[in-house]
């Protein structure tokens, strides 16, 4: 059978039929349904939602829909012993306490089981001491404090503002600096956009609003007690002392009303420069401790949360492929939320639901995709990407042999300005071609393509006339598929204007105010941006699952490899003397990149010319494309990060959310001037260049003619 016979409809008609079936009104309805009560991981409510989704996906027409459960380490506040922070006087009396919960949004006052703000996986403890303000608690902030200002955080409680980097990195940095507790807060400079009202009158964060979130440093491990293996019924679990990535000091988040009360009394050193000042009416003094009048007062944390092994449930739906059922294209997003999940994750889950419905409609009309499509509703993403990682660990042998691509589907929106895409270079051309075929939803771009509005609003910094596409980092469920298994991955959502809105994420992220009404009133009343994201995500899945030749262009990898090699070389060249002294050469890497470029070019020529009616040759060429991403995996992983195995990309060691290129070399070079043993340090740089050069060369050879 030819592909067209197998799938019953001509390819163009298929894609159009699929896209035309997607409806904004359905996404709106699904979002409402998913956001009426909290769906915290490990709770009965989230289990019930899993069963509802299972049932509806079956009704939509998928071949099978199963629940996959795991017993993983989660973290919850103590219901009878709330977490809070106090200012205490010299007698130990609490003269101020931070809030115990957020004021509920209108209409939700009687909803039960709203988890109060907490930092998931914080250990218990009641440390007290002087406060030190550490800005965003980034690596460079601690360098400024310790090296330039000579401020010692040892034995202090640090207060850091949310934003710029993943909160787990902030906590890790504070621990390394010797802090005995961490207070995280949302500063209006980062979470209150000028000229916009606070919720419920606008999309800004009110003073009582607080960002929840986990503070783990898992580095891709999944469940902290079963790294590398699924947390199944017969799992061997580590003791809590050996668990991966748990913080060692108490941590708690607060809103800016409470932060004002802590920061207004700060004394000690003045902020080093304006980049350390937020928007509160406080001096932003660094400390340590309070000013003269209040110098005998201290800060005390009261943290009583518990870590508990708890059952979680993924929903896995299958639409079997007609021609290549053993090739999997995966669309996955999480279902668990901190509270209502109005944006995170349900704006994404509603889109997945509508994509499943559309695929199901085509299937009921007799169509099947060429390749198998797997749909996933992941659990416990908010607790460290646990559901997706455990499932991938359980199915790793199948995935590494059969996984074509993974498309992530968390929040569909973080703004309503333009498209944002992060993906493997293999998908650049797919994304470009698809967005040229889709209509832009943006005002002022009526009748224009999505590609055009996207390129105008978010131009590529390197290539004129093209849109920006970013590197994949982490902080979401694609991590295990891309960084550990080497499956080509991508993600797309609508975003804000980063030029005019310099706050981090969206203001109400992980707060109780992330409701259906937030989306329906302020972000996307017509659900046109949600529909566009559904078309992009769904369109990518459709093409990946249905095109005869996989829509991957290996030449785009060659282009970025050269760019990344140039970048890492220029970083190294900031140390010309040491490069000379220790005979550090990048020749092997540049040579490998050159070879990759030439081989990729020849492969692309052969791809144009080969006989697509020969199923063996077709399968061979497609396998070379599928396995190219896999070829960038080093089985030994990155130093001290065994589950980050991709040699070209890894989450930044300083910010999990950001992607770093040639991470092994980058980390070896980072702060190298401060290393006590320069010979050893530069030896590691040379080793990492060797690993990178070998990997690029080995990947290139997978594209060579097979014999």
């Amino acid at each position: 059978k030819s592909s067209n016979e197998a799938t019953n409809i001509t390819p163009k008609h298929n894609m159009k039929a699929f896209l035309d079936e997607l409806k904004a009104e359905n996404i709106k309805k699904f979002l409402y349904n998913f956001t009426q009560i909290p769906h915290l991981a490990g709770t009965e409510q989230n289990f019930q939602l899993a069963k509802q989704i299972q049932s509806q996906w079956k009704e939509f027409g998928l071949d099978s829909v199963e629940l996959a459960h795991y017993d993983v380490l989660l973290s919850y506040p103590n219901k009878t012993h709330p977490n809070y922070i106090s200012i205490i006087n010299e007698d130990g009396n609490e003269i101020f306490n931070t809030s115990l919960f957020e004021p509920p949004p209108p209409g939700y006052e009687n909803v039960s089981d709203i988890v109060p703000p907490f930092s998931a996986f914080s250990p218990q403890g009641m440390p007290e001491g002087d406060l030190v303000y550490v800005n965003y608690a980034r690596t460079e902030d601690f360098f400024k404090l310790e090296r330039d200002m000579k401020i010692n955080c040892s034995g202090k409680i640090v207060i850091a503002r949310y934003g710029k980097v993943f909160r787990g990195n902030k906590v890790k940095n504070a621990q390394l600096a010797g802090a005995k507790g961490v207070i995280l807060y949302s500063d209006p400079a980062d979470y209150f956009a000028p000229g916009v009202k606070s919720y419920p009158d606008g999309w800004n964060l009110p003073g009582g609003g607080v960002q929840r979130g986990n503070i783990l440093n898992l580095n891709g491990a999944g469940d902290p007690l079963t790294p590398g293996y699924p947390a199944n019924e017969y799992a061997y679990r580590r003791g809590i002392a050996e668990a991966v990535g748990l913080p060692s000091i108490p941590v708690h988040p607060i809103g800016y009303y409470d932060a004002q009360k802590l920061l207004e009394k700060m004394g000690g050193s003045a902020p080093p420069d304006s980049s350390w000042r937020g928007s509160l009416k406080v001096p932003y003094n660094v400390g340590p401790g309070f000013t003269g009048n209040f110098s005998t007062q201290k800060v005390k944390m009261h943290i009583h949360s518990t870590n508990e092994v708890t059952r979680i449930y993924n929903v896995i739906g299958t639409l079997r492929g007609a021609v290549e059922p053993d090739r999997y294209v995966i669309l996955g997003g999480h279902r668990d939320s901190w509270v209502f999940g109005g944006i995170d994750p349900q704006s994404g889950a509603a889109v997945v639901h509508e994509i499943v419905r559309s695929f199901g409609t085509l299937k009921k009309e007799g169509w099947r995709p060429r390749r198998t499509i797997l749909f996933a509703s992941w659990d416990a993403e908010e607790f460290g990407l646990l559901g997706s990682t455990e499932w991938a660990e359980e199915n790793s042998r199948l995935l590494q042999e059969r996984g074509v691509a993974y498309i992530n589907a968390d929040s569909s929106i973080e703004g309503n300005y333009t498209l944002r895409v992060d993906c493997t270079p293999l998908m650049y051309s797919l994304v470009h071609n698809l967005t040229k075929e889709l209509k832009s939803p943006d005002e002022g771009f009526e009748g224009k393509s999505l590609y055009e509005s996207w390129t105008k609003k978010s131009p590529s910094p390197e290539f004129s006339g093209m849109p920006r596409i970013s590197k994949l980092g982490s902080g979401n469920d694609f991590e295990v598929f891309f960084q550990r298994l080497g499956i080509a991955s991508g993600r797309a959502r609508y975003t804000k204007n980063w030029e005019t809105n310099k706050f981090s994420g969206y203001p109400l992220y992980h707060s109780v105010y992330e409701t259906y009404e937030l989306v329906e009133k302020f972000y996307d009343p017509m659900f046109k941006y949600h529909l566009t994201v559904a078309q992009v995500r769904g369109g990518m899945v459709f093409e990946l699952a249905n095109s005869i030749v996989l829509p991957f262009d290996c030449r785009d990898y060659a282009v970025v490899l050269r760019k990344y090699a140039d970048k890492i070389y220029s970083i190294s060249m900031k140390h010309p003397q040491e490069m000379k002294t220790y005979s550090v050469s990048f020749d092997s890497l540049f040579s490998a990149v050159k070879n990759f470029t030439e081989i990729a070019s020849k492969f692309s020529e052969r791809l144009q010319d080969f006989d697509k009616s020969n199923p063996i040759v077709l399968r061979m060429m497609n396998d070379q494309l599928m396995f190219l991403e896999r070829a960038f995996i080093d089985p030994l992983g990155l130093p001290d990060r065994p589950f980050y195995r991709h040699v070209i990309y890894a989450p930044s060691s300083h910010n999990k959310y950001a992607g770093e290129s040639f991470p092994g070399i980058y980390d070896a070079l980072f702060d190298i001037e401060s290393k006590v043993d320069p010979s050893k340090a530069w030896g590691e740089v040379k080793r990492q260049i060797y690993v990178a050069a070998f990997t690029v060369q080995a990947a290139a050879e997978t594209l060579s003619e097979v014999a």
């Epitope: 101020f96 306490n97 809030s99 115990l100 509920p104 003073g207 009582g208 009303y257 004002q260 009360k261």
Partner: nanobody, 123 residues
Framework: EVQLVESGGGAVQPGRSLRLSCAAS????????MNWVRQAPGKGLDWVAF????????YYADSVKGRFTISRDNSKNTLYLQMNSLRPEDTAVYYC????????????????WGQGTMVTVSS
């Protein structure tokens, strides 16, 4: 209709106790800090006590500190003032008043008042 209704006032002897209640309707008590304010005969208004929306902080006027306790039951939409060791100078009309700002951590301007309940302390 948005309203606050105080109850529990009356005449008591010095040293005795009273418990005032304030029932809220037409708005969610759970989102707002609440105050007790009093007005002695022929005098101006005096702030007595404040409790944050979540009960995490309570503030008192020096004149009542250690004798009065403000509390709330958000599930019942009710605010309380437990008054112990009453003195003649506590004689006043007691009003509950809703804070203007959602989630405020310290007393702010009031925007809704009750009709008041009279407390008379005399021997």
């Amino acid at each position: 209709e948005v309203q606050l209704v105080e109850s529990g006032g009356g005449a008591v002897q010095p040293g005795r106790s009273l418990r005032l209640s304030c029932a809220a309707s037409g708005f969610p008590l759970i989102s707002y800090g609440m105050n007790w304010v009093r007005q002695a005969p022929g005098k101006g208004l005096d702030w007595v006590a404040f409790i944050t929306y979540d009960g995490s902080n309570r503030y008192y006027a020096d004149s009542v500190k250690g004798r009065f306790t403000i509390s709330r039951d958000n599930s019942k939409n009710t605010l309380y003032l437990q008054m112990n060791s009453l003195r003649p100078e506590d004689t006043a009309v007691y009003y509950c008043a809703k804070d203007r700002i959602v989630g405020a951590r310290v007393p702010d301007a009031y925007d809704i008042w009750g009709q008041g309940t009279m407390v008379t302390v005399s021997s």
